[in-house]
């Protein structure tokens, strides 16, 4: 029998390589049973996670899972860092693993992207 606890499916030690100036959606996959929980995003600053109050967020519903999305319109160099989503469920706070954004500033980026950047931006691969 599947648990009816809320689960936040951000992968442990996950990372994203993204370009400053591009739009980007950071997804927090949320599993719940009946009532959709209240979910928020925060950005890690040392050991504290600072709640992102005035940022655009949205929900995307799929058959077996929902996604609470943090929108970057566009990505800025200071968006670099680690993020976490949290859900309030039956007066419990459930925290996800943190996920790290590595922002490449196009102005300072060298012409040839690194192998990691190529892998995470497959449209750069001409195969």
């Amino acid at each position: 029998k599947e648990s009816c606890d809320v689960q936040l499916y951000i992968k442990r030690q996950s990372e994203h390589s993204i370009l400053a100036g591009d739009p980007f959606e950071l997804e927090c996959p949320v599993k719940y049973c009946a009532n959709r929980p209240h979910v928020t995003w925060c950005k890690l600053n040392g050991t504290t996670c600072v709640k992102l109050e005035d940022r655009q967020t949205s929900w995307k519903e799929e058959k077996n899972i929902s996604f609470f999305i943090l929108h970057f319109e566009p990505v800025l160099p200071n968006d670099n860092g680690s993020y976490r989503c949290s859900a309030n469920f039956q007066s419990n706070l459930i925290e996800s693993h943190s996920t790290t954004l590595y922002v490449t500033d196009v102005k300072s980026a060298s012409e040839r992207p690194s192998k990691d950047e190529m892998a995470s931006r497959p449209w750069l691969l001409y195969r």
Epitope: Q7, Y9, K11, R12, Q13, S14, E15, H16, S17, H97, K115, D116, A119, S120, R121, P122
Partner: antibody, heavy 120, light 112 residues
């Protein structure tokens, strides 16, 4: 049932490249990580790196940074390991490994391995 | 990189007797989430490795309870209370806390 089916044995010439594949069944690779591990004859295990198939992001052991390239295709539920500029040191069995389940994501299921022999 | 040191290199044990393998890491494996990402694997002759234990002490399903894992920080131990013939092979520890991930050098369990 979770399974990782790896491509067949390869005999390749020094200096050439080779691409190995690992097709998953019983789970979606986008929900986990895929690790690759090298085992030279009669030796221990070496972690090559990992890919997050959901976004293509890779992490490598620095020793393999210029040797290996990891890719994944969610549509076919398949991960790939490309090895370039092959030498006799690359003669080994290469395993793909599932990066485990939520919430721990520690390697659990292993493929059967692909033997790569580098010889002229 | 974190160095994982396993001892002994080879272990020769009579069936029915206990066995113990040590794994020491050069850095603390306690992660910031409070978990310790240390696993034990067994590679039987001619086979792929299989996971026996994860998070130091949690037994994988189907693994007999004669296997126990213990330890914390940098010192870890795998114990087999009574060795059986099917236990022969090479045992590896692996850390999943730090990058790059690293394996111990392996301990070969032989049956006397």
């Amino acid at each position: 049932e979770v399974q990782l089916q790896q491509s067949g044995a390869e005999l390749v010439k020094p200096g050439a490249s080779v691409e190995l594949s690992c097709t998953a069944s019983g789970f979606n690779i986008k929900d986990t990580y895929i690790y690759w591990v090298k085992q030279r004859p009669e030796q221990g295990l070496q972690w090559i790196g990992r890919i997050d198939p959901a976004n293509g992001h890779t992490k490598y052991d620095p020793r393999f940074q210029d040797k290996a390239t990891l890719t994944a295709e969610i549509s076919s539920n398949t991960a790939h390991l490309q090895l370039n500029s092959l030498t006799s040191e690359d003669t080994a069995v290469y395993f793909c490994v599932r990066g485990g389940d939520h919430p721990y994501y520690v390697m659990d299921w292993w493929g059967q391995g692909t033997s790569v022999t580098v010889s002229s | 990189a974190v160095v994982m040191t396993q001892t002994p290199l080879t272990l020769s044990v009579t069936i029915g007797q206990p066995a113990s393998i040590s794994c020491k890491s050069s850095q603390n494996l306690l992660d910031s989430d409070g978990k310790t990402y240390l696993i034990w694997l067994l590679q039987r002759p001619g086979q792929s490795p299989m996971r026996l234990i994860y998070l130091v002490s949690k037994l994988d399903s189907g693994v007999p309870d004669r296997f126990t894992g213990s330890g914390s920080g940098t010192d870890f131990t795998l114990k087999i209370s009574r060795v059986e013939a099917e236990d022969l092979g090479i045992y590896y520890c692996w850390q999943g806390t730090h990058f790059p991930r690293t394996f111990g050098g392996g301990t070969k369990l032989e049956i006397k």
